[in-house]
């Protein structure tokens, strides 16, 4: 096989030009040796038509050139004013004879079509660039070149080679020639706008000998992609505007009749109607980005457009992409509370719906942050460690098969106010947004723990009590030990349950938990809470510190505690130990496949690992009257 390479077949029409590029291996000898173009005869002989030594045959006189580009290891044969007689077999080659290294090229020149004023149609989108090709004959090589736009009978000059540019094309139109071509000039018109559409005429020379080409430019509005989404679900707009706007600010806007109102842009602008439920994520260095909107509402339906401009606002003549979003009101996603209210020091239980068909999917809860383009770092998940700053006060309770999971956050502060997202690694449509509003508390919390300064001594018995009001009388009370992978229910004893509901004494409604004997691993956060079946209610938290018995102090086992222990049978202790390997955060990459902005909180996995045995459940029993 020949190491020379080029086009095997070249086809054109009479009067046109061709530029045939031949590629050769990059060696010093090849760069400097003779290059040739010859025509293959019937007798097997290849007659030289042009060579790099300066030879030019009579039939090519005035219409052909051969140029070597040693830096690119190529040479180019330009042949103008083609006739049908130019049809034939040729070779482009290297060497002192025409038998050296060569490549066979077939050239076919057809008759000009019936319509000599063949109009070339250019179809471009708004904001893009068109390159209009204008061919001319050798005789007009040094003549003035121009492009004009037909307006009725007149043709108004857009640009010409004397550097004139029509004001409406200023900074958008350039006229240039390219490479070695001596029979073609180009006009680029960038940032196309609808009014640019129409018939253009490019011209080289003046009067009857002028060469003219017609070009019909069609400027298209982007065809909107149709998106059908359910109410309360989410939508992702994937925007790919091309490399030419990679460094410009990006935006997503919603079209009205006349304008397009920016919903979000990379300069920090965000429509308040989308607060807490929108994220903009750059995808790569080529200008691709995506916008995710959750908790779709009926009023979100409409025409959306993404674009790029340094201002971060829609600008005529800049590339755009369009969608039409339809929001189906017959949604499979259940209606859940969009606003949850809490008070400082109190707690909230947030119910997160998920696709019931995906009960084994991993569940997550993230905090939407407004900074930059919005992000949502994961705070807790079924296999994600609780984020730093939330230890002891945040837990996720999965209720397999119920189509919902509950997230409990206690020890609330006003800083907890904001937007939170429920999401899973399954059906991405099931993303719900909750706004948490935390107000200053004006009264004592419903649940109170005593003693409030909870320090237990190793080897001794330690009882902790949770006081609840009569309104929680009929609800199930529980104590649980908080660990990084949830809050594990512990055996406890409800003293209030022994009293009749008629004579509820506010002061004596107590649920107690006893650690007997106290072990070092009992140290940690404990929660007291109420629930009805799968519905979780108020919780309160207390940190129990565990210390060694000080030398010399007697081991006192309070008699009343012993008496209570005899009265109340010990309940079966619940296993609350945690296997080490289960406690690592392994977020499924599918969860974030199309939303990298939802940050993985599992990065602290190594430093936050819970100890192998999170609680000495065996020593915990209820013994309260």
């Amino acid at each position: 096989q020949s190491p020379i390479f080029g086009p095997q077949d070249v086809s054109s029409i009479e009067g046109n030009s061709v530029s045939i590029t031949c590629y050769y291996p990059d060696t010093s000898v090849n760069r400097h040796t003779r290059k040739y173009w010859c025509r293959q005869g019937a007798n097997g002989y290849c007659a030289t038509l042009i060579s790099s030594n300066g030879y030019l045959s009579k039939e090519y006189s005035g219409r052909a050139s051969l140029i070597n580009f040693p830096e690119n290891s190529t040479f180019v044969i330009n042949i103008a004013h083609l006739t049908q007689e130019d049809t034939g077999s040729y070779k482009c080659g290297l060497g002192t004879t025409n038998r050296g290294l060569f490549f066979d090229v077939s050239l076919e020149v057809s008759q000009v079509p019936e319509f000599p004023n063949d109009t070339h149609v250019y179809t471009k989108d708004i904001g893009r660039t068109v390159t209009i090709e204008c061919r001319f004959k050798e005789g007009n090589a040094h003549s003035k070149k121009s492009l004009c736009k037909k307006r009725g009978e007149a043709c108004e000059v857009v640009i010409d080679s004397t550097e004139y540019v029509d004001p409406s094309y200023k900074d958008r139109a350039i006229l240039f020639m390219k490479g070695t071509s001596r029979d073609i000039f180009y006009v680029n018109i960038s940032h196309l706008i609808p009014s640019d559409a129409g018939l253009y005429v490019c011209q080289a020379g003046e009067g009857p000998s002028a060469d003219k080409n017609n070009a019909d430019l069609q400027v298209l509005e982007p065809e909107p992609e149709l998106l059908y989404k359910d109410l309360r679900s989410s939508v992702t707009f994937e925007c790919d505007l091309g490399r030419e706007v990679a460094n410009d600010a990006k935006y997503l806007c919603r079209k009205n009749k006349e304008t397009c109102d920016v919903i979000i842009n990379t300069l920090g602008k965000r429509d308040p109607a989308f607060e807490g439920r929108i994220l903009l994520t750059p995808r790569d260095d080529n200008g691709r980005f995506s916008v995710l909107i959750t908790g779709l509402r009926k009023e979100d339906a409409g025409h959306y457009q993404c674009g790029a401009h340094s201002s971060g606002l829609p600008q005529e003549g800049w590339p755009v992409q369009a969608w039409q979003l339809f929001v189906n009101e017959e949604s499979t996603i259940p209606n859940s509370r969009s606003v949850v209210k809490g008070v400082t020091g109190g707690s909230v239980a947030i119910v997160c719906p998920y696709n019931p068909k995906e009960s084994s999917s991993l569940k997550y809860w993230c905090h939407w942050e407004a900074d930059e383009n919005g992000r949502c770092p994961v705070l807790v998940g079924t296999q994600a460690l609780v984020q730093e700053g939330y230890e002891g006060r945040l837990a996720l309770f999965d209720q397999p098969g119920s189509g919902a999971y509950t997230v409990i956050l206690n020890q609330l502060t006003t800083q907890d106010s904001g937007f939170y997202w429920c999401l899973t690694d399954g059906d991405s449509r099931w993303r719900t947004t909750i706004e948490l509003q935390v107000a200053e508390a004006t009264k004592k919390p419903d649940l109170e723990v005593t003693p409030q300064n909870a320090t237990a001594v190793i080897g001794e018995t330690f009882t902790i009590s949770c006081h609840y009001p009569c309104k929680f009388y009929s609800q199930e009370k529980y104590w649980c030990k908080w660990s990084n992978d949830g809050c594990h229910i512990l055996p406890s004893h409800d003293e209030g349950a022994r009293q009749s509901s008629v004579s509820c004494d506010q002061s004596s409604q107590i649920v107690s938990m006893t650690l007997n004997p106290v072990k070092k691993e009992d140290e940690g956060w404990y929660w007291c809470g109420v629930k009805e079946g799968q519905v979780y209610g108020e919780t309160t938290a207390i940190y129990v510190a565990v210390e060694e018995r000080t030398r010399g102090s007697p081991h006192i086992n309070p008699t009343d505690a012993n008496a209570r222990a005899k009265d109340a049978p010990e309940e079966e202790a619940m296993e609350s130990s945690v296997r080490e390997d289960e406690n690592k955060a392994n977020l499924d990459p599918r969860l974030f496949a199309d939303e990298r902005e939802i940050q993985n909180a599992g990065d602290q996995a190594q430093e936050n690992r819970a100890s192998g045995n999170a609680g000495s459940a065996g020593g915990q029993s209820g013994s309260s009257k």
Epitope: V10, I13, T21, N72, T131, L220
Partner: nanobody, 130 residues
Framework: QVQLVESGGGLVQTGGSLRLSCAAS????????MGWFRQAPGKEREFVAA??????????YVGDSVQGRFTISRDAAGNTVYLQMNSVKPEDTAVYYC?????????????????????WGKGTLVTVSS
């Protein structure tokens, strides 16, 4: 979004023929050049054929290993390119990828270099059985 969709791949016997098609679609995508590359398992992507056009002039390029057996052509609109594969051999077994260029490149750019093509299809598998 520019999309190149290949079709026509499949199982063919040695000596047989196959015609691959590649349709360029997207927001009024009008390519300037389209081509075919192939990649056999464990091998580098190899140039097969390309077609480039400028006005009424068309240039067709064919790779050494398929010279005389494979031909490339396009439809009148210029948005679909075809690869006619004749006298196929077992060594033609590969995933065939379509490539396209939207903007005229510098005249010296070699169509055989995959890096110089802007858009790619997902590929279609051609298996030649002996």
């Amino acid at each position: 979004q520019v999309q190149l969709v290949e079709s026509g791949g499949g199982l063919v016997q040695t000596g047989g023929s196959l015609r691959l098609s590649c349709a360029a679609s997207g927001r009024t995508f009008s390519p300037y050049a389209m081509g075919w590359f192939r990649q056999a398992p464990g091998k580098e992507r190899e140039f097969v054929a390309a077609i480039r056009w400028s006005g009424a002039t068309t240039y067709k390029y064919v790779g050494d290993s398929v010279q005389g057996r494979f031909t490339i052509s396009r439809d009148a609109a210029g948005n679909t390119v075809y690869l006619q594969m004749n006298s196929v051999k077992p060594e033609d077994t590969a995933v065939y990828y379509c490539a396209a260029d939207r903007v005229p490149k510098d005249i010296s750019i070699d169509p055989r270099n995959p890096k110089d093509w802007d858009y790619w299809g997902k590929g279609t598998l051609v298996t030649v059985s002996s």
